[in-house]
């Protein structure tokens, strides 16, 4: 009775529970041959399985984290716009982060991620969870690159103070550099937060998506020598 393929770690008990239910429901359908489970019950198994995985995903508080993600993205965006205004009005050399414009396109990505996470938290369909997972993985990668860019940007730009000194701090050069560095530091901090949130949401999304069994389930009925292989059809897009 207990022959089946497992796609999740042993500690993930949802699948085991689903299988136990399946074994309990196993009955021979009249005229269907010995030991073949009723196909109607398969949907119940899928639904039961997805319910458990949904709970796993919702445990990650996607709605709350999604809102936080959007708020951080908006803060980062406003920082970026302010930095650009300060830099362009100061007429000098700007931090690398201003040239790259990460705060603009990075924030857009995080807003999309956050929105998908909220949507997936409200209507936990596989499509939305998949979309949220994909965007959050992308956002994690983006956040890492942003952390690197901002670290380099801050380090290098700090040396611009030297050029301010050369001309005797013209047009409050030191003040401008300090403001831009402070904002760059804030963007760096926000990028770290974005990374933590995106990774956390990705982890919970992955628990729900990656732990969906897509393999073959072998049901060996006790009253038959014949083992029938019943492939699990994809879970219904609820």
């Amino acid at each position: 009775h207990q022959t089946y393929r497992r796609h999740c770690r042993p500690e993930e008990s949802t699948f085991s529970a689903a299988m136990t239910t399946m074994q309990g429901m196993e009955q021979a359908t009249p005229g269907a041959g010995p030991g073949v489970p009723q196909l109607g019950n398969m949907a119940v198994v899928h639904s039961h399985l997805w319910k458990g995985l949904q709970e796993k995903f919702l445990k990650g508080e996607p709605k709350v984290l999604g809102v936080v993600q959007i708020l951080i993205a908006l803060m980062s965006l406003s920082m970026g716009i302010t930095m650009m205004c300060v830099a362009f009005s100061a007429y000098g050399h700007y931090p690398i982060s201003v040239y790259i414009g990460y705060t603009i396109w990075g924030s857009v990505m995080f807003i999309i991620s956050g929105s998908l996470s909220i949507a997936a938290g409200i209507r936990t369909t596989k499509g939305l969870v998949r979309g949220s997972l994909g965007m959050n993985i992308t956002s994690s990668v983006l956040a890492v690159s942003a952390i690197l860019i901002n670290t380099i940007s801050l380090t290098i730009y700090s040396f611009y103070h030297r050029y301010c000194n050369y001309y005797g701090n013209p047009n409050n050069c030191h003040g401008t550099v300090s403001i831009l560095m402070g904002m760059d530091g804030m963007v760096l901090l926000l990028s770290v937060l974005e990374f933590c949130i995106a990774v956390s949401l990705s982890a919970f999304g992955c628990k729900a998506i990656c732990c969906t069994p897509g393999g073959v389930v072998l049901i060996i009925p006790s009253n038959s020598h014949m083992a029938e292989a019943a492939p699990l059809t994809p879970l219904n897009e609820v």
Epitope: Y91, G92, H93, F159, Y160
Partner: antibody, heavy 124, light 111 residues
Framework: QVQLQQSGAELARPGASVKLSCKAS????????MQWVKQRPGQGLEWIGA????????RYTQKFKGKATLSADKSSSTAYMQLSNLASEDSAVYYC?????????????????WGAGTTVTVSS | DIVLTQSPASLAVSLGQRATISCRAS??????????MNWFQQKPGQPPKLLIY???NQGSGVPARFSGSGSGTDFSLNIHPMEEDDTAMYFC?????????FGGGTKLEIK
């Protein structure tokens, strides 16, 4: 590419004034200091001063305060130097040059691009 | 102001040989671990052209035969091997502090 185009030769009377121009192209004019350098025939190079077209800041060497007035027009990406109360010792070639800045663990700044120069002749 | 003294005032070198021009500053031009010494080449009727910045870094498009060295107050420009096209005036310039100042120049000719 980065280019600095200077105005043509000037012939002036002693006591008169001349305004030299330096039109920049190929870079963001408002982000770099523009330098002005004097070279008398067969002599060395002498820094006059610098102007930042972006914020309008200027720096002069002591010798040229009152003699040279630096300015810039952002709309036409042109830097200007006015030389007043001309005397025979003001006869020289005047260059404009852009100052490039490289900052990092090792920071540098240097005059990387120069104009062809404007010859000013003061003669009665 | 920092005074730069170049030597020799003129120099004649055979083709393929090494030319060395010296520049001494009245005070150190080092700052932030960098030597703010630049070298320029000027041919008759032309503006100066940047050869070396930061004492030893080559300007863009400058042939490898031009090299700079030194720190503090003593610097030198080396040209090896000497080519016909290298006949020109050479100037050192400090950018440690405003006003930037230039050396008196060295006239390099072919022997």
């Amino acid at each position: 590419q980065v280019q600095l185009q200077q105005s043509g030769a000037e012939l002036a009377r002693p006591g008169a004034s001349v305004k030299l121009s330096c039109k920049a192209s190929g870079y963001t004019f408002t982000n770099y200091w523009m330098q002005w350098v004097k070279q008398r025939p067969g002599q060395g190079l002498e820094w006059i001063g610098a102007t930042h077209p972006g914020h309008g800041d200027t720096r002069y060497t002591q010798k040229f305060k009152g003699k040279a007035t630096l300015s810039a027009d952002k709309s036409s990406s042109t830097a200007y130097m006015q030389l007043s109360n001309l005397a025979s010792e003001d006869s020289a070639v005047y260059y404009c040059a852009r100052e490039e800045v490289y900052y990092g663990f090792r920071s540098y700044w240097y005059f990387d691009v120069w104009g062809a120069g404007t010859t000013v002749t003061v003669s009665s | 102001d920092i005074v730069l003294t170049q030597s020799p005032a003129s120099l004649a070198v055979s083709l393929g040989q090494r030319a060395t021009i010296s520049c001494r500053a009245s005070e150190s031009v080092d700052n932030y671990g960098v030597s703010f010494m630049n070298w320029f080449q000027q041919k008759p009727g032309q503006p100066p052209k940047l050869l070396i910045y930061g004492a030893s870094n080559q300007g863009s498009g400058v042939p490898a035969r031009f090299s700079g060295s030194g720190s503090g107050t003593d610097f030198s420009l080396n040209i090896h091997p000497m080519e016909e096209d290298d006949t020109a005036m050479y100037f050192c310039q400090q950018s440690k502090e405003v006003p930037p100042t230039f050396g008196g120049g060295t006239k390099l000719e072919i022997k």
